[in-house]
């Protein structure tokens, strides 16, 4: 309500995330992610739970496939409303390759820099969403260690959709995505049966991210 007692349209976060966090979401945008609007719906549900601002939580988004695109930087938007609008407009960039190590490494080296809005002394969180084994998995171990060395907390989400569509074994894929997650794995790793099911993990994921502030 405004000072003149008029209703002001605003989005109140479902659960306030008022302590500072710098969160970079790393999205697999390869063709096999289908349908894409399941990803944007997931983003919407997750982001609306956050209290976003220059002195609160900041969010940046990186999309990868064959190469990497910074969709927006940590300091690009200063409110939850602005971030929600921007996230809804993110288009799938496509490609057949899933360069997960490249995506994570780019997020670490570029998205989490002060030039892109990262704040000194603020906890760094990375959320990685992917649906397939990486084409650069020989690099993953080092890339994850580099994140570990920089105290970047990692939540990883394995979408099993393309495996289930092709009746393929998910074992190797799940192991890879588990290896990306911070310890303890059971608190940092999620898997969903398909893209449509992404929204079902938002509440738990949100709670676990907020728990990092304690």
């Amino acid at each position: 309500v405004s000072p003149t007692f008029q209703v002001v349209n605003s989005i109140a976060p479902v659960q306030e995330c008022s302590t500072q966090l710098d969160i970079v979401i790393v999205l697999d945008g390869s063709n096999s992610i289908y349908p894409w609007d399941s990803v944007t719906a997931f983003l919407n549900d997750l982001l609306k739970r956050m209290d976003i601002g220059p002195k609160q939580t900041q969010v940046g988004i990186v999309q990868y496939g064959e190469n990497v695109t910074h969709e927006f930087n940590l300091n690009k938007y200063s409110s939850t409303e602005e971030v929600l609008v921007a996230a809804k407009k993110i288009v799938q960039r496509g490609g057949r390759q899933t360069m997960t190590a490249l995506g994570i490494d780019t997020a670490r080296k570029e998205a989490f820099t002060e030039a892109r809005g990262a704040r000194r002394g603020v906890k760094k969180v990375m959320v990685i969403v992917t649906d397939g084994e990486s084409h650069d998995n020989h690099r993953l171990k080092k890339v994850i260690q580099d994140c570990e060395d920089e105290n970047i907390q990692r939540f990883s989400i394995a979408i099993l959709g393309s495996y289930n569509r092709g009746n393929l074994s998910t074992e190797k894929f799940v192991e890879e995505i588990k290896s990306i997650a911070s310890e303890p794995t059971e608190k940092h790793f999620f898997n969903v049966s398909d893209e449509l099911a992404l929204v079902t993990i938002v509440k738990t994921l949100g709670e676990r991210i907020f728990a990092l502030e304690a």
Partner: antibody, heavy 124, light 108 residues
Framework: EVQLVQSGAEVKKPGESLRISCKGS????????IGWVRQMPGKGLEWMGI????????RYSPSFQGQVTISADKSISTAYLQWSSLKASDTAMYYC??????????????????WGQGTLVTVS | EIVLTQSPGTLSLSPGERATLSCRAS???????LAWYQQKPAQAPRLLIY???RRATGIPDRFSGSGSGTDFTLTISRLEPEDFAVYYC?????????FGQGTTVEIK
């Protein structure tokens, strides 16, 4: 803005060869599959085949396998549909369309979200 | 391959009326991978609905899709003059794409 622009109408004689084109713009053309769809006069839509311009991986509908060739030149963001010997029954409107989805590992799925304006091919 | 049968072949209605178009598959369509397209004379098809019920970008909310398994429906809640066209359903859950034969929605 995503656009698929097809080559102009063609009038050919039976036995002649033909190649029609579909040029994509406004998106990363090498990163999305492009499909071809036939519509014979007064009839419905038939899927012919699909190509990934990034590496020219191609899949055909069994009904069109061996009847047509689908190719692409990624350097100019263009997909092609060609015939080596046209028949009167090839008279139709041909559309290209971008696939929102994938066709990897033997499994294809997805919808066609953007379409070209169509190329009318008349064989008589 | 999955055969899609659309009914009715032709639907004669007046502007403002509700249109209900049916698409029946010869076997279950996996993951509800069914789309609907609209085609007007001398124009390319236009995507309306995908994954059975999701509206494509820019499609008015008078268009809605529903169904799963073998039975799918496209509903136009209130026909506008520009909605008179041919509508095709398409399945894409079997590593190939097949279309229904189309339903023509014409002005009564």
């Amino acid at each position: 803005e995503v656009q698929l622009v097809q080559s102009g109408a063609e009038v050919k004689k039976p036995g002649e060869s033909l190649r029609i084109s579909c040029k994509g713009s406004g998106y990363s053309v090498t990163s999305y599959w492009i499909g071809w769809v036939r519509q014979m006069p007064g009839k419905g839509l038939e899927w012919m085949g699909i190509i990934y311009p990034g590496d020219s991986d191609t899949r055909y509908s069994p009904s069109f396998q061996g009847q047509v060739t689908i190719s692409a030149d990624k350097s100019i963001s263009t997909a092609y549909l060609q015939w080596s010997s046209l028949k009167a029954s090839d008279t139709a409107m041909y559309y290209c369309a971008r696939l929102q989805g994938d066709c990897s590992g033997g499994t294809c799925y997805g919808h066609f979200d953007y379409w070209g304006q169509g190329t009318l091919v008349t064989v008589s | 391959e999955i055969v899609l049968t659309q009914s009715p072949g032709t639907l004669s209605l007046s502007p403002g009326e509700r249109a209900t178009l049916s698409c029946r598959a010869s076997q279950s369509v996996s993951s509800s991978y069914l789309a609907w397209y609209q085609q007007k004379p001398a124009q390319a098809p236009r995507l309306l609905i995908y994954v059975a019920s999701r509206r494509a970008t820019g499609i008015p909310d008078r268009f809605s899709g529903s169904g799963s398994g073998t039975d799918f429906t496209l509903t136009i809640s209130r026909l506008e003059p520009e909605d008179f066209a041919v509508y095709y359903c398409q399945q894409y859950g079997t590593s190939s794409w097949t279309f229904g034969q189309g339903t023509t929605v014409e002005i009564k």
